[in-house]
Amino acid sequence: MKVLQEPTCVSDYMSISTCEWKMNGPTNCSTELRLLYQLVFLLSEAHTCIPENNGGAGCVCHLLMDDVVSADNYTLDLWAGQQLLWKGSFKPSEHVKPRAPGNLTVHTNVSDTLLLTWSNPYPPDNYLYNHLTYAVNIWSENDPADFRIYNVTYLEPSLRIAASTLKSGISYRARVRAWAQCYNTTWSEWSPSTKWHNSYREPFEQH
């Protein structure tokens, strides 16, 4: 049994880091493998993560962690029974993938303006809370070419757009994702999408 693709890990900068790797053949990850992880500080002890399958030869492990600080460094040991398959380390603050925003809502009752709001996925005492910016993706269910991205570079989790910038009388979907420039994070996963019917009054033509 060998590791084909070494574990790579990302942290949500809150309580979970996710590590993924590939073995050289089909593996029952949860019965055959264990990932041990240990914070490199005095009196810290190793914790065990039981991996799950992620495709035939792929494994994924969700490591429980404390609130992350930039000084945190973990040793990682991947074991198959008594055999050490791989040894490495992981600094959560250098591999951050934010949590996905939630509760995306489209408010359509604001005088021909669409107001999209969502929730910041972090509590106020988390460092990322005040450092997230967002991308909102809006697309038409009827027309695959009608696909747009709005970059929200301010902190407030909301976006206002004129309803008239979208076609009237058809259904649209929206989703949102987040990233934090300060930690050069990757983008989060997209939030679940929300659907609405876009309709607005065309302005009277003046002759």
């Epitope: 500080f41 005095l42 009196l43 002890e45 000084a71």
Partner: antibody, heavy 117, light 112 residues
Framework: EVQLVESGGGLVQPGGSLRLSCAAS????????MTWVRQAPGKGLEWVSA????????YYADSFKGRFTISRDNSKNTLYLQLNSLRAEDTAVYYC??????????WGQGTLVTVSS | DIVMTQSPLSLPVTPGEPASISCKSS???????????LDWYLQKPGQSPQLLIY???FTAKGVPDRFSGSGSGTDFTLKISRVEAEDVGIYYC?????????FGGGTKVEIK
């Protein structure tokens, strides 16, 4: 919210014994090393002993080895300190604390041990 | 054992003015990743100690930003940018390099 509540202190005669307890809540107890620190009246802080999260590893200041024993019951989320052969100079407030990143991130309110005849 | 030495023993302060406390260790507290294994604690009158600063310069959650830690190796400083009445108490440094953990003797901060 992390809470640590010590109990078991009181008046004991020289040469006597006591068992201090520290009930923990608000965090996953098994994941953290725990420590006892004491403070004699009007004096500074003195580290006594620590125990790893699993309970398998224990650590003591030299002056307490052989007389004090640290232990934990992870099923009860409780830390203990057994004090034997007590002396007048062991009179102190005994604090339990939760370790993180080497340091003591949360402290209990303390329990007073008085050794006197 | 690592010996921690704090100064001054007592520090009378004026509210609104800055204050600083020194802590020296008998051996270097700097580790390979560039972090210093030193914490600062405050024990307010009649209360348990509370963590202020960890790893030399990281402010603990809920601690006002007027508190800051600096220094490296064997020489460290805790600074209060503008002292408030609620900051009175005894301040301790502690190393986290190895067991036994050892504390400095404490610095008593009181209002003038």
């Amino acid at each position: 919210e992390v809470q640590l509540v010590e109990s078991g202190g009181g008046l004991v005669q020289p040469g006597g014994s006591l068992r201090l307890s520290c009930a923990a809540s608000g965090f996953t107890f098994t994941r953290y090393a725990m420590t006892w620190v004491r403070q004699a009246p009007g004096k500074g802080l003195e580290w006594v002993s620590a125990i790893g999260g699993s309970g398998g590893r224990t650590y003591y200041a030299d002056s307490f080895k052989g007389r004090f024993t640290i232990s934990r019951d992870n099923s009860k989320n409780t830390l203990y300190l057994q004090l034997n052969s007590l002396r007048a100079e062991d009179t102190a407030v005994y604090y339990c604390a939760r370790h993180l990143r080497g340091g003591l991130w949360n402290w209990g309110q303390g329990t007073l041990v008085t050794v006197s005849s | 054992d690592i010996v921690m030495t704090q100064s001054p023993l007592s520090l009378p302060v004026t509210p609104g003015e800055p204050a600083s406390i020194s802590c020296k260790s008998s051996q270097s507290l700097l580790e390979g990743q560039g972090y210093n294994r030193l914490d600062w604690y405050l024990q307010k009158p009649g209360q348990s100690p509370q963590l202020l600063i960890y790893l030399g310069s990281f402010t603990a959650k809920g601690v006002p930003d007027r508190f800051s830690g600096s220094g490296s190796g064997t020489d460290f400083t805790l600074k209060i940018s503008r002292v408030e009445a609620e900051d009175v108490g005894i301040y301790y440094c502690m190393h986290t390099v190895q067991t036994p953990l050892t504390f400095g003797g404490g610095t008593k901060v009181e209002i003038k």
